[in-house]
Interface confidence: low
């Protein structure tokens, strides 16, 4: 399977909400012995390998934000910890998964990574990730709503192994 990032740049005004999205592509094994671990974290630019450094999002680690379920099942983080930080990660039946960040501040600007780990019980793990940039703007030139920039075709199927 692969992870696609439909948008590689999100430009948002301060105070707005944004939903960053990744999409699970390709054949997904729906067997009983396969589960998917999906999560989000921040990283930094200029690394040799993008997304190799895992930093928290608003003090929440990738473990705090994870979704754990089988195949294309729906799931979301409903626990108070994430919501208290204005965060919610979710997944639908079509392989889309997202993190919603509420009331953006300039400190939220940066590189965000989604991570999918396919876990075959008693066997191996397969990891893929996608990266996208969030730019939060303030002042008179800030947009009234978030503006998203599509990934190029080669970027949208970001299949780098983590």
């Amino acid at each position: 399977f692969k992870v696609a990032t439909p948008y590689s740049l999100y430009v948002c005004p301060e105070g707005q909400n944004v939903t960053l999205t990744c999409r699970l592509l390709g054949p997904v094994d729906k067997g009983h012995d396969v589960t998917f671990y999906k999560t989000w974290y921040r990283s930094s630019r200029g690394e040799v390998q993008t997304c190799s450094e895992r930093r928290p999002i608003r003090n929440l680690t990738f473990q705090d934000l994870h979704l754990h379920h089988g195949g294309h099942q729906a799931a979301n983080t409903s626990h108070d910890l994430a919501q208290r930080h204005g965060l919610e990660s979710a997944s639908d039946h079509h392989g889309n998964f997202s993190i919603t960040m509420r009331n953006l501040t300039l400190l939220d600007s940066g590189l965000y990574c989604c991570l999918v780990v396919e876990i075959r019980h008693h066997h191996s793990e397969h990891r893929v990730h996608g990266a996208m940039e969030l730019q939060v703007q303030t002042g008179k030139d800030a947009p009234s709503n978030c503006v998203v920039y599509p990934s190029s075709s080669q970027d949208s199927e970001n299949i780098t192994a983590a």
Partner: antibody
Framework: QVQLVQSGAEVKKPGASVKVSCKAS????????ISWVRQAPGQGLEWMGE????????YYYEKFKGRVTMTRDTSTSTVYMELSSLRSEDTAVYYC??????????WGQGTLVTVSS | EIVLTQSPDFQSVTPKEKVTITCSAS?????ITWYQQKPDQSPKLLIK???KLASGVPSRFSGSGSGTDFTLTINSLEAEDAATYYC?????????FGQGTRLEIK
């Protein structure tokens, strides 16, 4: 003040490549997308693609994919647009423009590329 | 791809006249941007987010519209307004321009 200064006019033969530069100054180079737009003689504006200098991500209009390459050099705050396999219909003025969220707020002076045998 | 169609292609007008240029989108979009291009010059930002005047643009210019139909209006045209006007959308990829409307001053 914000400035985008483009390289000079070029005359190329069909089949050749051209590389146009766009040097930015007066703002933080890595914070803004740079778009490329071209205008054939007596014709309208046509968006070609753009590059986000912070990450190097590029977005090309399908029509130009495979022929256009946009790159950036953060050390000199310069963006480059290279167009290959030139044909006569590529004769145009090529503009770079800074993108402020949803608008192109500053434009380069344009670079005339003439393709002629 | 969203096609933007401007009307008219060309208009010859007298100073102080009111001018209306329309831009019709093939699909609904969030907003439109207008650019002005004078002969042998680079395009210049005129109106952003459908109706907001760019810095330094005279108040005789205004923009309106939503969905698929947008309008640029110049009240009391002045000689310096002779130019080609383009609408542009960045709501849906790929970004596209209208074919342009050339205004000539009689």
């Amino acid at each position: 003040q914000v400035q985008l200064v483009q390289s000079g006019a070029e005359v190329k033969k069909p089949g050749a490549s051209v590389k146009v530069s766009c040097k930015a100054s007066g703002y933080t180079f890595t914070d803004y997308v740079i778009s490329w737009v071209r205008q054939a003689p007596g014709q309208g504006l046509e968006w070609m693609g753009e590059i986000y200098p912070g990450s190097g991500n590029t977005y090309y209009y399908e029509k130009f994919k495979g022929r256009v390459t946009m790159t950036r050099d953060t050390s000199t705050s310069t963006v480059y647009m290279e167009l290959s396999s030139l044909r006569s219909e590529d004769t145009a003025v090529y503009y770079c423009a800074r993108v402020l969220v949803s608008v192109m707020d500053y434009w380069g002076q344009g670079t005339l590329v003439t393709v002629s045998s | 791809e969203i096609v933007l169609t401007q009307s008219p292609d060309f208009q010859s007008v007298t100073p102080k006249e009111k001018v209306t240029i329309t831009c019709s989108a093939s699909s609904s979009i969030n907003y439109i941007t207008w650019y002005q291009q004078k002969p042998d010059q680079s395009p210049k930002l005129l109106i952003k987010d459908t109706s907001k005047l760019a810095s330094g643009v005279p108040s005789r210019f205004s923009g309106s519209g939503s969905g698929t139909d947008f309008t640029l209006t110049i009240n009391s045209l002045e000689a310096e307004d002779a130019a080609t006007y383009y609408c542009h959308q960045r709501s849906s990829y790929p970004w596209t321009f209208g074919q342009g409307t050339r205004l000539e001053i009689k």
